[in-house]
Interface confidence: low
């Protein structure tokens, strides 16, 4: 249970004095418009603060954009607006920060009407200096860096041209016209769709998918009749219009579009959509929308080829195209995902999977919470998590669920306890075991963040009134201390800490307001003196992830292996430090049927772990075509789940079947073919 602030909580000694010495205020003069904040690089301490404006705007009212720079994690800021020649920077482009530790920044400016192109300011030294460059085009999108080489940039123009720079924006070349969407792939490859007739919208479903592997010297058309495309992990997906009607299907490629296979997924109609919810190099979570404006669909999980899909979750909440889904990857524990389903009575319930979509269950009720009014049985209910959908519905939910890879097992989220999500004011809940068990952590809605790889959790109450108090916990949310960081309360706008949760600095952003003036202000608090010593071996304890039954030899086995982690003891008040690396010890498990999914032409009957052959494939929406012609597929009905590392144990060997299926996709098969040679 979570004692809150009662006698069981060991207080951090002298924390007020320690934090007061490490609280840094910065008042921003003449800061108006939208404020955006970006970290430049990892562990550099460099933060850029920029005020941006929507176009068009009344120049007389606002003056120019302001740019501030900090190199000490936000404790001090320097006005560097002169480096961008007092220009307007456009809100929709923000700051384009280069990948990794490249130190590159691109700001896109608004230039006065009639100019032949836009203007950018470029820095490659962590924003110490900027170079102004006039563009030969007006950008439509933010500059996109190649993940492999931060000198390579691409952008779309307002005229639908695809522009590429090979020298970090110094020179630009239009490599293609009539482009709708462009994305970097691996190895500096660019994928893009083009229209032939009127426009992107008019040609939707008749677009061509192109690839260039040499930044526009040569091109290859890798798909036609394209509706859209997406990249996820090592997979390239295209939704392709069917020949005879307005439906479309997903095709997948694992070789950058050289070869395509039809994904064994339902086709969708005009009003429906596909969405890649998550993807890694092993597999993909794909959402397929239901027909009609239902607001839900089905989650499917793929095999290692991205071709064969297993139904994972029905009635998955996902509002109309481009809308909201609560699908969340819990990055603090392997295999864990949380999302929402829309039940028959139109209530929304949270589901969690611990095995990468194999099984979904409700979240266990926190022991220190009561079931609310949504519960039919006051003793039996579940925790339901508020995520993107609740935020979009303007419920009192200031933040989505939070987890960090280096804060093992920790998940923090707003939620309610009952039979479904409640519209009442939520509380904040924490799990320290990746979502298996939960505890109420804070009453009412809060902003929260994780520092020092989980060593500190910081929270600020969500309130319409000015605030001046921050809460922090050094024991994974069991006990909380409060610290008054300023005498003059501020209207709070955001909590900012360096991405990656390794920092011990937190910045509180807000503004002071009086009758005539308002000023932006930030308070940066460094917690280093609270955690006054480095953690030692004795501060860590061994924790077996996914453990549900310690008596069971296979306890903790998920996707064929178990992992033991060294976790910081809750009672230890010490620094993990910026160089902290998660220590884990994996061990391989024996295979069971749970480690296999059913291959093409096979399915699992309800409550059975065996894969049985489909009685007959006619009427099933199952098409398997690797090569755009009749495919001879030998299978024993089972296929190892992607990422599963089990060895030995059950080896589901049975008579090998030779399945033959006709490929019906024109996308894959230029001429109608069959298994006989001509």
């Amino acid at each position: 249970s979570a004692p809150g602030e009662d006698e069981e909580c060991g207080r951090v000694r002298d924390f007020v004095a320690k934090l007061a010495n490490n609280t840094h205020q910065h008042v921003f003069d003449d800061l108006r418009g939208s404020v955006s904040l970006s970290w430049v690089g990892d562990s550099t301490g460099v933060i850029l603060v920029l005020t941006t404006f929507h176009v068009p705007l009344v120049i007389m009212t606002f003056g120019q954009s302001k740019l501030y720079r900090s190199e000490d994690y936000g404790k001090n800021f320097k006005d560097i607006t002169d480096l961008i020649n007092n220009t307007f920077i456009r809100t929709e482009f923000g700051m384009a920060i280069g990948p990794e530790n490249s130190g590159k920044v691109v700001l896109t400016a608004e230039v006065s009407g009639g100019s032949r192109g836009g203007r950018i300011f470029r820095s490659s030294d962590f924003a110490k200096n900027f170079v102004q460059t006039d563009l030969p085009f007006h950008p439509l999108t933010q500059m996109m860096y190649s993940p492999q080489n931060s000198d390579y940039l691409l952008a779309l123009s307002t005229e639908n041209g695809l522009w590429v720079s090979k020298n970090f924006g110094g020179k630009w070349e239009e490599i293609h016209k009539a482009v709708c969407l462009a994305k970097w792939g691996s190895d500096n490859t660019i994928f893009f769709t083009t229209y032939a007739n009127g426009s992107c919208k008019a040609d939707l479903g008749a677009l061509e998918l192109w690839r260039t592997s040499d930044l526009g010297k040569s091109f290859k058309t890798i798909g036609v009749k394209i509706y859209s495309f997406g990249l996820g992990g090592r997979f390239l997906f295209a939704s392709v219009m069917a020949d005879k009607d307005t439906t479309r299907r997903i095709h997948v490629s694992t070789d950058q579009g050289d070869t395509w296979s039809m994904a064994q997924l339902p086709s969708v109609g005009q009003e429906q959509f596909y969405s890649i919810l998550a993807a890694n190099d092993d597999m993909v979570f794909m959402h397929v929308d239901e027909p009609g404006d239902t607001g839900f669909g089905t989650i499917f999980t793929s095999d290692d080829r991205g071709i064969v899909y297993s139904k994972s979750l029905d009635r998955h909440l996902y509002t109309t195209t481009g809308g909201e889904t609560d699908f969340t990857n819990v990055t603090s524990l392997r295999g864990v995902y949380i999302t929402s389903v829309l039940s028959e009575d139109n209530s929304i319930q949270t589901m969690i999977t611990f095995d990468q979509g194999g099984r979904w269950t409700h979240l266990r009720k926190p022991e220190n919470s009561e079931c609310d009014a949504t519960a039919k049985n006051k003793n039996e209910c579940s925790l339901h998590i508020h995520a993107s959908y609740s935020i979009s519905q303007k419920l009192n939910v200031p933040m989505a669920p939070l987890s960090e890879p280096n804060a093992v097992g920790i998940v923090i989220a707003h939620g309610s306890v009952g039979d479904a999500i409640s519209v009442m004011v939520p509380d904040v809940y924490i799990s320290d075991d990746g979502g298996y068990s939960w505890t109420k952590m804070l009453e009412g809605p809060h902003y929260y963040t994780i520092l020092d790889s989980g060593g500190i959790i910081v929270a600020i109450e969500h309130s319409s009134r000015p605030i001046n108090v921050i809460k922090f916990s050094t024991d994974e949310g069991q006990c909380w201390q409060t610290y008054t960081f300023t005498r003059d309360p501020i209207y709070f706008t955001g909590l900012a800490s360096e991405p990656g949760a390794r920092s011990m600095n937190i910045s509180i952003w807000g503004f002071t307001a009086s009758f005539l003036t308002s000023q932006w202000v930030s308070y940066t608090i460094d917690f280093k003196d609270i955690l006054e010593r480095n953690c030692e071996e004795k501060d860590y304890t061994i924790w077996l992830a996914h453990s549900t039954d310690p008596e069971d030899y296979e306890d903790g086995c998920i996707l064929g292996y178990k992992e033991q982690f060294l976790r910081l003891r809750k009672s230890s008040v010490c620094q993990n430090g910026r160089d902290y690396v998660v220590t884990k010890q994996p061990s391989i498990c024996l295979c069971s049927l749970e480690d296999f999914l059913c291959d093409f032409g096979y399915y699992r009957p309800e409550n059975d772990s065996k894969c049985v052959e489909q009685p007959e494939l006619k009427g099933h929406d199952l098409e398997f075509c690797l090569y755009g012609r009749e495919e001879h597929l030998t299978t024993n009905g089972y296929r190892k789940i992607p990422g599963d590392k089990c060895q030995g144990g059950v080896n589901p060997v049975r008579e090998v079947k030779d399945l033959k299926k006709k490929c019906t996709s024109n996308f894959l098969s230029p001429e109608k073919q069959n298994s006989k040679s001509n």
Partner: antibody, heavy 129, light 107 residues
């Protein structure tokens, strides 16, 4: 650099099987298909089939259907071609060749074949009683 | 299957001269055609792909043209190292098929 190294020459009796290996290096093994092509003494090139290293899926020329099996081992970046029920007409040099496009056409106006751009050195298989 | 026919079977050309090799497909293969060069005791080498694109490292004297069913490989000025057997190959429909080859020999 990108290369394909094949196993050594084999002498087999009619009715036996032969298994030729082809080890790839210098590129991501699973990113390209692999074709097998043979050449009988004094004859032209004959395509036998193709394997997709990602899932191990195969497609064989009708002539070899039922006699040829292509497999791969991603841990060693190696593909194998096994030909059974050997007869004297199977005496040939067997080549593996990296085939970037595989057989999956991307649609009528859009196919662009890149050709078999890297070849193994060849493995001579002699079938003789 | 698609049958590829090459002509002539043998072409005698003097060094420095132009050589034109033909390849005909029994049905359209669009531009899904490659040309290979093979010297005695060696593996084939890719020369041209996509009917007309030179492979990496192939000299400019080699060029490919054609689309559909008729294709041509041209060697503008034969060098001594160009005397070899040349094969065309289609990749429009499985199974892939090769032409019978054209032997380019010294006149």
């Amino acid at each position: 650099q990108v290369q394909l190294v094949q196993s050594g020459a084999e002498v087999k009796k009619p009715g036996a099987s032969v298994k030729v290996s082809c080890k790839a290096s210098g590129y991501t093994f699973t990113s390209r298909y692999m074709s097998w092509v043979r050449q009988a003494p004094g004859q032209g090139l004959e395509w036998m089939g193709i394997i997709n290293p990602v899932g191990g899926s195969t497609s064989y020329a009708q002539k070899f259907q039922g006699r040829v099996t292509m497999t791969r081992d991603t841990s060693t970046s190696t593909v194998y071609m096994e030909l059974s029920s050997l007869r004297s007409e199977d005496t040939a040099v067997y080549y593996c060749a990296r085939d970037p496009s595989g057989i999956a056409a991307a649609g009528p106006a859009s196919r662009y074949y890149y050709g078999m751009d890297v070849w193994g050195q060849g493995t001579t298989v002699t079938v003789s009683s | 299957e698609i049958v590829m026919t090459q002509s002539p079977a043998t072409l005698s050309v003097s060094p420095g001269e132009r050589a034109t090799l033909s390849c005909r497909a029994s049905q359209s293969v669009s531009s899904n055609l490659a040309w290979y060069q093979q010297k005695p005791g060696q593996a084939p080498r890719l020369l041209i792909y996509g009917a007309s694109t030179r492979a990496t490292g192939i000299p400019a004297r080699f060029s490919g043209s054609g689309s559909g069913t008729e294709f041509t490989l041209t060697i503008s000025s034969l060098q001594s190292e160009d005397f070899a057997v040349y094969y065309c190959q289609q990749a429009r429909l499985g199974p892939w098929t090769f032409g019978g080859g054209t032997k380019v020999e010294i006149k």
